[in-house]
Interface confidence: medium
C-alpha cells in the first residue's frame, strides 16, 4: 500500500507512457533514433520504477531508474540522490512533464521530458511543454522523439 501522501500521485502516473519530447539547459550530444514506451511501475512505499529503451547509434540501451519518493508530492530522487525529479501534470489531458536537475558526468544539468499516454503527438501539449521549458530557462532545442514499440539494434 502506498503512503497516503504520494499514493494518488504514484498511481496516477503508473503505466505506459510515450516519451514525446525532451530538452535541456545544455547540449545533449545525441538524439535517440527512437524510444520505446516508458513503463512507470509503482513500488511499495511510493517509489516508482521507470523503464525505457532508447535506440542510439544503432544500439539499444535499456534504462531502468528507481525514483525514490520524498515528503514533497510529485518530487523524487534518482541516481543515488544525484538527481531530483519532479513529475507534474500538463494542463493537457493525459500528459505529464518530468523535470529533473542534478549531476550528469560531474556537471550540473537540468532536463525536461514530455510524456503522453497516446503515441500521437499533441501540438497543444507540445506548445505547453515549450512554454514550460522557456520558463525554466531550458534553452536547447526541443527534440521530438520517434516512437517504437520495440527496439531493434542496427535498424529502426
Amino acid at each position: 500500500q502506498d503512503t497516503p501522501a504520494l499514493g494518488k500521485d504514484t498511481v496516477a502516473v503508473s503505466g505506459k507512457w510515450y516519451l514525446k519530447a525532451m530538452t535541456a539547459d545544455q547540449e545533449v550530444p545525441e538524439k535517440p533514433d527512437s524510444v520505446t514506451p516508458m513503463i512507470l511501475k509503482a513500488q511499495k512505499g511510493g517509489n516508482l520504477e521507470a523503464k525505457i529503451t532508447m535506440l542510439t547509434n544503432g544500439q539499444c540501451q535499456n534504462i531502468t531508474v528507481v525514483l525514490h519518493k520524498t515528503s514533497e508530492p510529485g518530487k523524487y530522487t534518482a541516481y543515488e540522490g544525484q538527481r531530483v525529479v519532479f513529475i507534474q501534470p500538463s494542463p493537457v489531458r493525459d500528459h505529464y512533464i518530468l523535470y529533473c536537475e542534478g549531476e550528469l558526468h560531474g556537471r550540473q544539468i537540468r532536463m525536461a521530458k514530455l510524456l503522453g499516454r497516446d503515441p500521437e503527438q499533441s501540438q497543444e501539449a507540445l506548445e505547453d511543454f515549450r512554454e514550460f521549458s522557456r520558463a525554466k530557462g531550458l534553452n536547447q532545442e526541443i527534440l521530438e522523439l520517434a516512437q517504437s514499440e520495440t527496439c531493434s539494434p542496427g535498424g529502426q
Epitope: 535541456a24 547509434n57 539499444c60 531508474v65
Partner: nanobody, 122 residues
Framework: QVKLEESGGGLVQAGGSLRLSCVAS????????TGWYRQAPGREREFVAT????????YYADSVKGRFTISRDNAKNTVYLQMNSLKPEDTAVYYC???????????????WGQGTQVTVSS
C-alpha cells in the same frame, strides 16, 4: 548484454600510481561512451571520469581532476584510467561501464563488472 572486465587494481602507497584497464565485449565499442565509477566501503557509488565516444571530451570529478586521466583504445575494446598522486581517500572498488546515450548513464549494478579493488595506504 555487454560484458565488462576490470583489472589493474592493487595496494599502493600514497603518492603512487596505478593504471586500470577495462575490456568490453562487443563490436561497436567505438560508438560507446565510457566511464569509471568507484564505491568505497559504506559509501554510495560515485562518478570518477567519463569519455565521450565522439570528440574525445573528458569529464572528471573534482576530487580527481589533475591526477586521473581516462583514455581508450578502440582497437582493443579497452578503456583505461591512469591514476597518479594517489591518496588514501581514493581507496575503493573501481568499476567501468559503457553506454550509448550520453544523457542516460548506467544506473544499476546488475549490468556492471566485478570491479577492481584499489587500496591506497598512508
Amino acid at each position: 548484454q555487454v560484458k565488462l572486465e576490470e583489472s589493474g587494481g592493487g595496494l599502493v602507497q600514497a603518492g603512487g600510481s596505478l593504471r586500470l584497464s577495462c575490456v568490453a565485449s562487443g563490436r561497436t565499442f567505438s560508438r560507446w561512451h565510457t566511464g569509471w565509477y568507484r564505491q568505497a566501503p559504506g559509501r554510495e557509488r560515485e562518478f570518477v571520469a567519463t569519455l565521450r565516444a565522439s570528440g574525445g571530451d573528458t569529464y572528471y570529478a573534482d576530487s580527481v581532476k589533475g591526477r586521473f586521466t581516462i583514455s581508450r583504445d578502440n582497437a582493443k575494446n579497452t578503456v583505461y584510467l591512469q591514476m597518479n598522486s594517489l591518496k588514501p581517500e581514493d581507496t575503493a572498488v573501481y568499476y567501468c561501464n559503457v553506454w550509448a546515450n550520453w544523457g542516460a548513464p548506467p544506473s544499476d549494478f546488475s549490468s556492471w563488472g566485478q570491479g577492481t579493488q584499489v587500496t591506497v595506504s598512508s
